[in-house]
């Protein structure tokens, strides 16, 4: 009698994550009587994938009706494939007994899973930094296979070069992750700037995935202060202005001091935005000169975004 053959015609099968995979297996003879089982891997640590007789295998179905008389097709379909399903699958014939005895295994079919990278997530520094400082942005994407991937950073469309990228794990795995850090030098004009992390992979239909971060979340542009006096009014009052310009973010508190004593405190709110994303604010203080015998020292004190206060002083001359 001819020796039983267990035929797995495909050496390898590749599928996209989320799809179904069909693993083909036929036997050359109905005898000896005994079941077919599917395993992933070989040797003592192999994992049972499908056993017609018992067990609950929710994602695995038989392609043909295995209970049908004279059935020699023991192909299976695994639905909703994930990268974790990758491996070599063996169709194994057993001889019926107590217990069943393994008789012959197919040559195995390697299942390869291609999976798309997740949308890149870009995170910036925890605290704001001022212009001329360098900040780091991190981009992460996960779950892709195969391992080959390209990641590029752009600031306002220009590719960044101060970049460090790692793909993990280094060895063979069912899926991979990428993590990249880009160092970006901030300028005062960066409030409206954007960094983009662009990930390209074989599974993407020609269009890279992009993650973005706005530099407005990472930058602090400290204000310029200028205190000036308007001409004396007829009622002996002097109008002194404090111009606070080119600052970001808007969070700003301004305090007027007359000879070191707090005269008034104001909070910036609902300011119009400059073209470059920064803000300007002007505060006025009326000083009654006739109420003073000596010159008045006026100080405009600005506390911006929780930073130490910045002062600009001005002396109003009181004529004898």
């Amino acid at each position: 009698e001819e020796e039983l053959q267990v035929i797995q015609p495909e050496k390898s099968v590749s599928v996209a994550a989320g799809d179904s995979a069909t693993l083909n297996c036929t036997v050359s003879s109905l005898i000896p009587v005994g079941p077919i089982q599917w395993f992933r891997g070989a040797g003592p640590g192999r994992e049972l994938i499908y056993n017609l007789k018992e067990g609950h295998f929710p994602r695995v179905t038989a392609v043909s009706d295995p209970t049908k008389r004279n059935n020699m097709d023991f192909s299976i379909r695994i639905s909703n494939i994930t990268p974790a399903d990758a491996g070599t699958y063996y169709c194994v014939k057993f001889r019926k007994g107590s217990p069943d005895v393994e008789l012959k295994s197919g040559a195995g079919t390697e299942l390869s899973v291609r999976a798309k990278p997740s949308a890149p997530v870009v995170s910036g520094p925890a605290v704001r930094a001022t212009a001329e400082h360098t900040v780091s942005f991190t981009c992460e994407s996960h779950g892709f296979s195969p391992r080959d991937i390209t990641l590029k950073w752009f600031k306002n469309g220009n590719e960044l070069s101060d970049v460090q990228t790692n793909v993990d794990p280094a060895g063979k795995s069912v899926s991979y992750s990428i993590r990249s850090t880009a160092r970006v030098l901030l300028t005062r004009r960066d409030v409206h700037s954007q960094v983009i992390c662009e990930v390209a992979h074989v599974t993407l239909q020609g269009d890279p995935l992009r993650g973005t971060a706005n530099l407005s979340e990472a930058i602090r542009v400290p204000p310029f202060l200028e205190v000036t006096q308007q001409s004396m009014r007829a009622d002996n009052q002097v109008n002194v202005t404090c111009q606070v310009t080119k600052f970001y973010p808007q969070r700003l508190q301004l305090t007027w001091l007359e000879n070191g004593n707090v005269s008034r405190t104001e909070m910036a709110s609902a300011l119009p935005e400059n073209k470059d994303g920064t803000y300007n604010w002007t505060s006025w203080l009326l000083v009654n000169v006739s109420a003073h015998r000596d010159d008045v020292k006026l100080t405009c004190q600005v506390e911006h975004d929780g930073q130490p206060a910045v002062n600009k002083s001005f002396s109003v001359k009181v004529s004898a």
């Epitope: 050496k11 390898s12 590749s14 599928v15 996209a16 390869s112 291609r114 195969p146 080959d148 991937i149 390209t150 390209a200 992979h201 074989v202 599974t203 993407l204 239909q205 020609g206 269009d207």
Partner: antibody, heavy 116, light 109 residues
Framework: VQLVESGGRLGQPGTSLTLSCTVS????????MGWFRQAPGKGLEYIGI?????SPYYASWVNGRFTISKTSTTMDLKMNSLRSEDTATYFC?????????????WGPGTLVTVSS | DIQMTQSPSSLSASVGDRVTITCRAS??????LAWYQQKPGKAPKLLIY???FLYSGVPSRFSGSGSGTDFTLTISSLQPEDFATYYC???????????FGQGTKVEIK
Amino acid sequence: VQLVESGGRLGQPGTSLTLSCTVSGFSLSSYVMGWFRQAPGKGLEYIGIISSSGSPYYASWVNGRFTISKTSTTMDLKMNSLRSEDTATYFCARVGPLGVDYFNIWGPGTLVTVSS
Amino acid sequence: DIQMTQSPSSLSASVGDRVTITCRASQSINSYLAWYQQKPGKAPKLLIYSASFLYSGVPSRFSGSGSGTDFTLTISSLQPEDFATYYCQSWHYISRSYTFGQGTKVEIK
């Protein structure tokens, strides 16, 4: 799933010509599509692709002479400043469902002859 | 750009012969290699993708192997319908560009 090229004809050197690839059975917004050519008796040559969102990418030799664009059911190849060496059969093809590294569906091709 | 060198450029074989065609990339393309069959006046047909995966509907006598820079297409037992020209095609994941080998013509001995 089918691809059919059209627009191939005899063209004069220095003129322009637009080839079209009409698709059926799938959406152009889901796949990368490519243009290739084959001069008589020669091998296959890659011209360029257009991504699912409509971004074109070209072989380095194209140098701006060819432009790939698409609508919902057709992909076009506009060829400017035709030369005799552009004489070839032009094929359009679709990448496979698993990735952009291979082309599993091809059109039958359309012949372009450039001669004065 | 990556260069793909295919060899031999032509070969003569008989029905039933085992035929091997090789393709070498000028730099590593990992496993991003496809093989196509083309008959005169026809469009190419995909045989193998990702270096070793048989495309659906392609007879199992065709097989592919290799990774990195060296790849092989094997026809285990040549059939009359297999007389054609075979091309390898690479995809480079960094440049995202495609390159073909110059082709191998398989003729009847």
